[in-house]
């Protein structure tokens, strides 16, 4: 079994390598941004609401297409369940340094946990996406 | 209404210390990353120091670096600034920011100026 | 360390003409995510900096549609489309792609 389990590691070492996960990045990024367009972000202060919607983000169609180009990546993770974990998780640390909120991360980890799911896929039932070094504010 | 005040600013002799204050209100100050940016007298702006909104990441200007210290105190609303081994060319206004969780400064304070001075 | 070299330093400009800022850095500022981490803020005179465009293209909130942000990569610009007198002031571009820097600064003042 431990044998086993060391060639699975390998593979799913391979797997993440050769996996390009850019896409998935760049379509959560979007789409918590766009979320954040239509409703507003700081409940302290709803009359300044930060941002403003931006026609880019509105259009929707170049997220879509990382969506698509996502899920076409996550696919190759969809009989190993460890695996697939083990990209959520590169993907949480390769964006952690962005999200400057507590807000920001907490909604990056909702959409990152259903992603598996928004792609016809099964979702890893345990998958801990807290970033490593520094704990959960870690930038 | 967003409210930043800085505070403990004035005069001080070259290598002694100083610790700058920020309140913040009208924001959810301990959710997100807080910084520290400098105007010398008629000069351009220059970023120091940003902590992150649990207070577990620090980081620095090289101009700074081991002198300056950030930190802050979520139960007050309060972020701070140590200067230590203060030099002539730390002669500024010292503005804090808020973060817009995104990396871009959106919310600022009206600046308190430090002289350091013989 | 990324350095970011704006131009002109001065700018003269006639109300209801449109006025445009550089910003080059000294390395790409296009992240994984796509986005690129430049933003773009007004000081007026006697005031704080105001955030005016963030991640290069997009308006802060209640700032007015005159401003606009484009470019990629290492090359950005600044454009107001007509020149306002309130508009007066020193713009700064700033990267956000590691820890953060300013640009030297552009001064706006009417002709």
């Known amino acids: 079994r431990q044998q086993w389990e060391l060639q699975g590691d390998r593979r799913c070492q391979s797997q993440l390598e050769r996996a390009n996960l850019r896409p998935c990045e760049q379509h959560l990024m979007q789409k918590i941004q766009r979320d954040e367009d239509s409703y507003g972000r700081d409940p302290y202060s709803p009359s300044q609401d930060p941002y403003s919607p931006s026609p880019y983000d509105r259009r929707g169609a170049g997220s879509s297409q990382h969506q698509e180009r996502c899920c076409n990546e996550l696919n190759e993770f969809e009989n190993n369940q460890r695996c697939m974990c083990e990209a959520l998780q590169q993907i949480m640390e390769n964006q952690s340094d962005r999200l400057q909120g507590r807000q920001q991360e907490q909604q990056f980890k909702r959409e990152l946990r259903n992603l598996p799911q928004q792609c016809g896929l099964r979702a890893p039932q345990r998958c801990d996406l807290e970033v490593e070094s520094g704990g959960r504010d870690r930038y | 209404q967003v409210q930043l005040v800085e505070s403990g600013g004035g005069v001080v002799q070259p290598g002694r210390s100083l610790r700058l204050s920020c309140a913040a209100s009208?924001?959810?100050?301990?959710?997100?990353?807080m910084h520290w940016v400098r105007q010398a007298p008629g000069k351009g702006l220059e970023w120091v120091a940003a902590?992150?909104?649990?207070?577990?990441?620090?980081y620095y200007a090289d101009s700074v670096k081991g002198r300056f210290t950030i930190s802050r105190d979520n139960s007050k609303n309060t972020l701070y600034l140590q200067m230590n081994s203060l030099r002539a060319e730390d002669t500024a206004v010292y503005y804090c920011?808020?973060?817009?969780?995104?990396?871009?400064?959106?919310?600022w304070g009206q600046g308190t100026l430090v002289t350091v001075s013989s | 360390e990324i350095v970011l070299t704006q131009s002109p330093l001065s700018l003269p400009v006639t109300p209801g003409e449109p006025a445009s800022i550089s910003c080059r850095s000294s390395?790409?500022?296009?992240?994984?995510?796509?986005?690129?981490?430049l933003d773009w803020y007004l000081q007026k005179p006697g005031q704080s900096p105001q955030l005016l465009i963030y991640?290069?293209?997009k308006r802060a909130s209640g700032v007015p549609d005159r401003f606009s942000g484009s470019g990629s990569g290492t090359d950005f610009t600044l454009k107001i489309s007509r020149v306002e007198a309130e508009d007066v002031g020193v713009y700064y571009c700033?990267?956000?792609?590691?820890?953060?820097?300013f640009g030297q600064g552009t001064k706006v003042e009417i002709k």
């Open positions: 920011a808020r973060d817009s969780g995104y990396r871009s400064l959106l919310h």
């Open positions: 009208g924001i959810a100050f301990n959710d997100y990353t």
């Open positions: 902590i992150s909104y649990g207070g577990t990441n620090k």
């Open positions: 390395q790409s500022l296009v992240h994984r995510n796509g986005y690129n981490y």
């Open positions: 991640m290069a293209s």
């Open positions: 700033m990267q956000a792609l590691q820890t953060w820097t």
